[in-house]
Amino acid sequence: MMTGTIETTGNISAEKGGSIILQCHLSSTTAQVTQVNWEQQDQLLAICNADLGWHISPSFKDRVAPGPGLGLTLQSLTVNDTGEYFCIYHTYPDGTYTGRIFLEVLESSVAEHGARFQIP
């Protein structure tokens, strides 16, 4: 039975050319996390593997950075980065937990950042 829950940064906005931290946190389960995937629609952004560590998808190697923690930092944002992002926790024995974040990249300098998410 899957008892865990994923908290995310939710809906966030950022300014074009800036950077943003995508953050998820899995709680309420003792399942072992074997890997965490970050995906944008069907495109792989990054993987954090429990044994091998971080892998940034080569297409994004110049503007995606691992962390903090199991989160992901997107840099040099463009309007095309607007959309849904998913953190996918692969765990044993529970299975897969998925969190969703919607990022809006704004042209204006009045981009309102969502509250900075803190891992408890």
């Epitope: 792989l44 080569p58 692969h90």
Partner: antibody, heavy 126, light 109 residues
């Protein structure tokens, strides 16, 4: 400690079929790795032949023009290479290798070939 | 077919810095890997994903990538570093994987 050991005939006749096997110890052939074949003609550089994932997915060097087939035998914890229509140009040292990946489910996120066999020499001659 | 281009040879004196380059059109969006092959031995992975060093590889080995060029740097080359070095990557569609032609590093002892 993971070890790979190639085996097969040292001499193959032209137009024949080359069959090589790589025995895996210290790791399961069903684990999340690409199992690879690489060759090196005498005095030349390395050439990637192809690879197979535990799911059965395969990738091949297009230069082989469909002459190559890589397969896995889970019961024997080994994988194999078959190369048909052999010519003298296929004379080489053949290596098997394990390539680790970050995404254990799909094989995405290539880490690199971190364990290699010692190589086996194959000569094509009549 | 996709090609990775390396210089055939590089020579340094012991203690000097050796730099081996690898150029390929897809490298801005692909990773470079570097393998060391000493005479009569199987290759050894010394750098993966442009700049990561596997455990057991000396710190004098480092990698970098900029644009269409990847570089393997050996800071303070030692006689035992004399070997052939091959870069390795993928084409723009992800497969096939391909080796560069190899670079023979001579450490003039």
């Amino acid at each position: 400690q993971v070890q790979l050991q190639e085996s097969g005939p040292g001499l193959v006749r032209p137009s024949g079929t080359l069959s090589l096997t790589c025995a895996v110890s210290g790791d399961s052939i069903s684990s999340s790795n690409w199992w690879s074949w690489v060759r090196q003609p005498p005095g030349k550089g390395l050439e990637w032949i192809g690879e197979i994932y535990h799911s059965g997915n395969t990738n091949y060097n297009p230069s082989l023009k469909s002459r190559g087939t890589i397969s896995v035998d889970k019961s024997k914890n080994q994988f194999s290479l078959k190369l048909t229509s052999i010519t003298a140009a296929d004379t080489a040292v053949y290596y098997c290798a394990r390539a680790r990946v970050y995404d254990i489910l799909t094989g995405r996120g290539y880490y690199g070939m971190d364990v290699w066999g010692q190589g086996t020499t194959v000569t094509v001659s009549s | 077919s996709y090609e990775l281009t390396q210089p055939p040879s590089v020579s340094v004196s012991p203690g000097q810095t050796a730099r081996i380059t690898c150029s390929g059109d897809a490298l801005p969006k692909k990773y470079a890997y570097w393998y060391q092959q000493k005479s009569g031995q199987a290759p050894v992975l010394v750098i993966h994903e442009d700049r990561k060093r596997p455990s057991g590889i000396p710190e004098r080995f480092s990698g970098s990538s900029s644009g269409t060029m990847a570089t393997l740097t050996i800071s303070g080359a030692q006689v035992e570093d004399e070997a052939d070095y091959y870069c390795f990557s993928t084409d723009s569609s992800g497969n096939p994987r391909v080796f560069g032609g190899g670079t023979k590093l001579t450490v003039l002892g």
